[in-house]
């Protein structure tokens, strides 16, 4: 928008610096850390958000706890390399020249190696399983009401097309949300399931990336839905390549 006298901000990403220096005095916002321009009418990519998070002071939180079920983010935060579109580069390296391959959500999918490690392509994460445990309530939530509320959340807040929310499972107190999005299904302008899952994760942890209203107000028939634990599992279109040593 035009921001002649207004403070200029990005409603969908707190981790930005904005100024009215775009064409015609329009507000232009750039992600912290990378300096890349972001579209403030949609979600910012997870890669740019992680990079911004690493550039901000006093951030030492890990993402999700290790699990043996599927590919999970055991490595926690790192300062990623993003491509010009804001996606993760297939190969990531740290300052000590240790390198590894990642998937489209930035989770390591190979053993760590040196600078000779090759990552031929960015492998797409096509299935994300979000595993939640809610705080005790007087009774179990009605499954269909819970399903409707969570589908509505992903459609409205993260602008994720309803077809990408494959299922919502519920066995009190565990809720599982399945997001599925193949390369062939994702059209131009579609929100990526990895970005939606990351925004959701931050919302659930009380670290909303949105400005304005900010935090979530999840309710099922008026009853607050409060999450006390989150685990996120990532499944790639091509299985990860880890040595047998890691699997034992």
């Amino acid at each position: 928008h035009t921001a002649a006298q207004d403070n200029c901000t990005c409603p969908t990403n707190k981790m930005t610096v904005c100024s009215p220096d775009g064409p015609g005095g329009r507000c232009q916002c750039r992600a912290l850390g990378s300096g890349m321009a972001v579209d403030c009418s949609t979600l910012t990519s997870k890669c740019l958000l992680l990079k911004a998070r690493m550039s901000a002071p006093k951030n030492a939180r890990t993402l999700v706890r290790p699990s043996e079920h599927a590919l999970v983010d055991n490595d926690g935060l790192y300062d990623p390399d993003c491509d010009p579109e804001g996606r993760f580069k297939a190969r990531q390296c740290n300052q000590t020249s240790v390198c590894w391959c990642v998937n489209s959500v930035g989770v390591r999918r190979t053993d760590k190696g040196d600078l000779s490690l090759r990552c031929d392509e960015l492998v797409r994460t096509h299935h994300i399983l979000i595993d939640l445990r809610h705080r005790p309530t007087a009774g179990a939530f009605n499954h269909s009401d819970l399903d409707a509320e969570l589908r509505r959340l992903f459609r409205e807040r993260y602008r994720l097309h309803p077809k990408f929310v494959a299922a919502v499972h519920y066995e009190q107190p565990t809720i599982q949300i399945e997001l599925r999005q193949n390369t062939s299904q994702k059209a131009a302008g579609d929100v990526d399931i990895g970005d939606a899952a990351y925004y959701f994760e931050r919302d659930i942890k009380g670290e909303s990336l949105f400005q304005g209203r900010g935090g979530l107000d999840l309710r099922v028939r008026g009853e607050p839905l409060q999450v006390e634990r989150t685990l996120i599992y990532y499944l790639d279109e091509i299985p990860p390549k880890f040595s047998m040593k890691r699997l034992t």
Partner: antibody, heavy 126, light 107 residues
Framework: AVTLDESGGGLQTPGGGLSLVCKAS????????MFWVRQAPGKGLEWVGV????????NYAPAVKGRATISRDNGQSTLRLQLNNLRAEDTGTYYC???????????????????WGHGTEVIVSS | ALALTQPSSVSANPGETVKITCSGG???YGWYQQKSPGSAPVTVI????KRPSNIPSRFSGSLSGSTNTLIITGVQAEDEAVYFC????????????FGAGTTLTVL
């Protein structure tokens, strides 16, 4: 059918307060954000404020901030606007409206209104 | 505060297609028809392109960038009214806002 019925308008004195009530029916009130919008005579629409479905969040236009309080009773399906320290420029028709996007990051947007009340007229004059 | 920009007036012959633009906000635009001052507005489009079930299909909405367009395909005499667009001011405060209104005259 969705019905929003405002009441409480009328002649008010400057410096005084008013309380407008909107009675909702025909939908699950607890599932929707609600707005107040007003229109001064011969002027355009003006967003007054919003309350989320649980009542835990409110936001107000700069022109009424500090003077307005929006509240709701989900059990009675009623929305209320309390406006104090009334001024002549508060004169107009006040509409209660329903928001269609309670989870949206920009849920305060006037662009999510999908239903309106008939309005109640407020005149602030001595 | 941010203002939404829309033309003050447009005119068309019956049966023609009318386009009214609204710009200056973020996604989350709506269009509201008011046939006379003080009468209750009627939502013709909300959330960029959603049409209430009681609104004729000749009304549609389209979002391109930060500009929303109300399209009336085959305008009719009863469509003559003032059309207000609604949106979102993303400068701190994050409030709802309306455009000044566009008067549609059907010739």
């Amino acid at each position: 059918a969705v019905t929003l019925d405002e009441s409480g308008g009328g002649l008010q004195t400057p410096g005084g307060g008013l309380s407008l009530v909107c009675k909702a029916s025909g939908f699950d009130f607890i599932d929707y954000d609600m707005f107040w919008v007003r229109q001064a005579p011969g002027k355009g629409l003006e967003w007054v404020g919003v309350i989320n479905r649980s009542g835990s969040y409110t936001n107000y236009a700069p022109a009424v901030k500090g003077r307005a309080t929006i509240s709701r009773d989900n059990g009675q399906s009623t929305l209320r606007l309390q406006l104090n320290n009334l001024r002549a420029e508060d004169t107009g028709t006040y509409y209660c409206a329903r928001g269609a996007c309670t989870h949206c990051w920009d849920a305060d947007s006037a662009g999510y209104i999908d239903a309106w009340g008939h309005g109640t007229e407020v005149i602030v004059s001595s | 505060a941010l203002a939404l920009t829309q033309p003050s007036s447009v005119s068309a012959n019956p049966g023609e297609t009318v386009k009214i633009t609204c710009s200056g906000g973020y996604s989350g635009y709506g269009w509201y028809q008011q046939k006379s001052p003080g009468s209750a507005p009627v939502t013709v489009i909300y959330w960029n392109d959603k049409r209430p079930s009681n609104i004729p299909s000749r009304f549609s909405g389209s979002l391109s960038g930060s500009t929303n367009t109300l399209i009336i395909t085959g305008v009719q005499a009863e469509d003559e009214a003032v059309y207000f667009c609604g949106g979102y001011d993303s400068s701190p405060g994050y409030v709802g806002i309306f455009g000044a209104g566009t008067t549609l005259t059907v010739l």
